[in-house]
């Protein structure tokens, strides 16, 4: 009998309000045994896959999607989905990325008050991949 797959979660580091030109990393989390994580943008019209999955905790795995230099066009809604053989999960909740004009000089803070300012600590470091999943009829247009 196939297991019910839990919904993935999504977060952003260092936060969801990012100055133009700064970096942001989306973090997708799911259960142990995920082969592929997919970051979807704006109702699945574009997406990026990764099989580079790490061990986040005893019960979770995760993948990271980094945008090195955020542009205005990167603003929008993002969500995660994963493939754990033999099926795909449901989508995560949406996370909205806001891009703001940089104000001030090089000493301006990169993050909004209250946002996490660095990568989360992970007890163990690893990676992942396997067979590429079925594309569900979507076109793999790069998000960044």
């Amino acid at each position: 009998q196939e297991e019910d797959l839990p919904r993935p979660s999504i977060s952003a580091e260092p936060g969801t309000v990012i100055p133009l030109g700064s970096h942001v990393t989306f973090v997708c989390r799911g259960p142990v045994g995920v082969q592929t994580f997919r970051l979807e943008r704006d109702s699945r019209s574009t997406y990026n896959d990764t099989e580079d999955v790490s061990q986040a905790s005893p019960s979770e795995s995760e993948a990271r999607f980094r945008i090195d230099s955020v542009r205005e066009g990167n603003a929008g809604l993002y969500r995660c989905i994963y493939y754990k053989p033999p099926k795909w999960s449901e989508q995560s909740d949406y996370l909205e990325l806001l891009v703001k004009e940089s104000s001030g000089g090089p000493d301006s803070p990169d993050t909004e008050p209250g946002s996490s300012a660095g990568p989360t600590q992970r007890p163990s470091d690893n990676s992942h991949n396997e067979h590429a999943p079925a594309s569900q009829g979507l076109k793999a247009e790069h998000l960044y």
Epitope: G33, D52, Q55, S59, F65, S124, D125, N129
Partner: antibody
Framework: EVQLVESGGGLVQPKGSLKLSCAAS????????MYWVRQAPGKGLEWVAR??????????YYADSVKDRFTISRDDSQSMLYLQMNNLKTEDTARYYC??????????WGQGTLVTVSA | DIQMAQSSSSFSVSLGDRVTITCKAS??????LAWYQQKPGNAPRLLIS???SLETGVPSRFSGSGSGKDYTLSITSLQTEDVATYYC?????????FGGGTRLEIK
Amino acid sequence: EVQLVESGGGLVQPKGSLKLSCAASGFTFNTNAMYWVRQAPGKGLEWVARIRSKSSNYATYYADSVKDRFTISRDDSQSMLYLQMNNLKTEDTARYYCVRGGSGFFAYWGQGTLVTVSA
Amino acid sequence: DIQMAQSSSSFSVSLGDRVTITCKASEDIYIRLAWYQQKPGNAPRLLISTATSLETGVPSRFSGSGSGKDYTLSITSLQTEDVATYYCQQYWSTPYTFGGGTRLEIK
């Protein structure tokens, strides 16, 4: 079909250097973590090095036995994986496998290239 | 580093036997355990990941079980083509480590 083809092995003297290459095809190379695993003649398997994908900043990890001597790198535009081996020791003699990984497990293996370190 | 200890370095078995190979980790590896089969002159082949998940194309006579520190690879009815060396490997933390291998030989 996933294909991993290693090259660059051979006979080298102790303290010498060698660079191994691995040509990858049949899968999306740039979204995968990649590994080198070795096997000394008649012995078991030993993980050597790992390199993550661009979305994880190409982070690298090494076995203690090769740290500061070996360097793993990749060229995503050419789907190539490399292992630069410096200051080689006789105990580095082994068959070196290029591996497409899982989340730390090893899903697809090349046929390996033999490195012999001997005076 | 996490040490991986396999039950024995070799087994003498008969065709049709049920074979069980055990692997013990020095600490909890949270089911991040893989099994490989290696035949002489060939590269290893992944059989099982996440302790129990059978890879595509691996015969159903192979199965994996276990959790915590203790894991098992079972072959329900040994076939000629199963004569090989089997390795376990943990991927909970780096450095990734293998067991010493268990060689199956026909009696």
